[in-house]
Interface confidence: low
Amino acid sequence: LQDPCSNCPAGTFCDNNRRQICSPCPPNSFSSAGGQRTCDICRQCKGVFRTRKECSSTSNAECDCTPGFHCLGAGCSMCEQDCKQGQELTKKGCKDCCFGTFNDQKRGICRPWTNCSLDGKSVLVNGTKERDVVCGPSPADLSPGASSVTPPAPAREPGHSPQ
């Protein structure tokens, strides 16, 4: 036997108090699918949250964050304070990145500069609080006649000249 409530479309609920008549969702509530016995309360974008999309009878409100803050978590469940580039957010507020670290965004943590020497490369441009170092070619790559994309020459065989 078909459930009579299945005929109730999104934006309504199946009202048991009225012999399973489909009633519109009350103000500040919604149902995003048909056949629901209750409507869900709309999310309220209070305080640090701002309304990005108003609640309707068929869809929940969507929040974002007031300027100076950014969303975190699924569906913008939290707002976190922005910092400047070159800073990270700590429990005591925005703090400058320590020497040797950088942050090129308004959010997130300070990350260590790339260690160019790990790849056998030189530092072409020094890092700052806001920018990572730029690694240059390795000293071997700069030797006369070498190309930074040429692989090392194989061992020479008789009758062959080096590449």
Partner: antibody
Framework: QVQLQESGPGLVKPSETLSITCTVS????????VHWVRQPPGKGLEGLGV???????NYNSALMSRLTISKDNSKSQVSLKMSSLTAADTAMYYC???????????WGQGTTVTVSS | DIQMTQSPSSLSASLGDRVTISCSAS??????LNWYQQKPDGTVKLLIY???TLHSGVPSRFSGSGSGTDFTLTISSLQPEDVATYYC?????????FGGGTKLEIK
């Protein structure tokens, strides 16, 4: 106890640039925003602009081209600069702390600015 | 920018009277509305935020209501210290804007 104290020149000549400082005590500028508000004699409050904890700013669209708000977190100071002054800029200038729930919970006492030659 | 309109611009009432001040927004602002009190000496204080939440230390005779575009500040029983100018302020959209103010005097 959180306190905000404005300090300004008092008298400024037309076409010059106004510079006012708001010194904040008992509260960190890395945790709260500061909004500037002015009140011409006998008139209502007018929001000028805000500087957020991270340093970004928003300005009153009608005054945007003349306004600059900046801050020095280490000195706990926020400054307002307004260029090309006219007599219409004569007002009491207030700074106010902006909380994370977007109200101005602490206000300075205000500083009077008169634009006159 | 969102325009905020207050009425009346001034009013005179007797001690103990119930006083209501209206504030209207040029577009819907949900409940993103605050009320401030400015004393004759220029001191400004927050009274109510988010339409109806009383700020700490504010007497319970003050209350706020409304939603969307129309809002009300009510003083249930007027006291001598309530002589002031009252301002509404929206924070739905930047730039945040104030109403023109309502000057409250005692008869």
């Amino acid at each position: 106890q959180v306190q905000l104290q404005e300090s300004g020149p008092g008298l400024v000549k037309p076409s010059e640039t106004l510079s006012i400082t708001c010194t904040v005590s008992g509260s960190s500028l890395t945790s709260y925003g500061v909004h500037w508000v002015r009140q011409p004699p006998g008139k209502g409050l007018e929001g000028l602009g805000v500087i957020w904890p991270g340093g970004s700013t928003n300005y009153n669209s009608a005054l945007m081209s003349r306004l600059t708000i900046s801050k020095d977190n280490s000195k706990s100071q926020v400054s307002l600069k307004m260029s090309s002054l006219t007599a219409a800029d004569t007002a009491m200038y207030y700074c106010a702390r902006v909380t994370g729930t977007w109200y101005f919970d602490v206000w300075g006492q205000g500083t009077t600015v008169t634009v006159s030659s | 920018d969102i325009q905020m309109t207050q009425s009346p611009s001034s009013l005179s009432a007797s001690l103990g009277d119930r006083v209501t001040i209206s504030c209207s927004a040029s577009q819907g602002i949900s409940n993103y509305l605050n009320w401030y009190q400015q004393k004759p000496d220029g001191t400004v204080k927050l009274l109510i935020y988010y339409t109806s939440t009383l700020h700490s230390g504010v007497p319970s005779r003050f209350s706020g209501s409304g939603s969307g575009t129309d809002f009300t500040l009510t003083i249930s029983s007027l006291q001598p210290e309530d002589v002031a100018t009252y301002y509404c302020q929206q924070y739905s959209k930047l730039p945040w804007t104030f109403g023109g103010g309502t000057k409250l005097e005692i008869k």
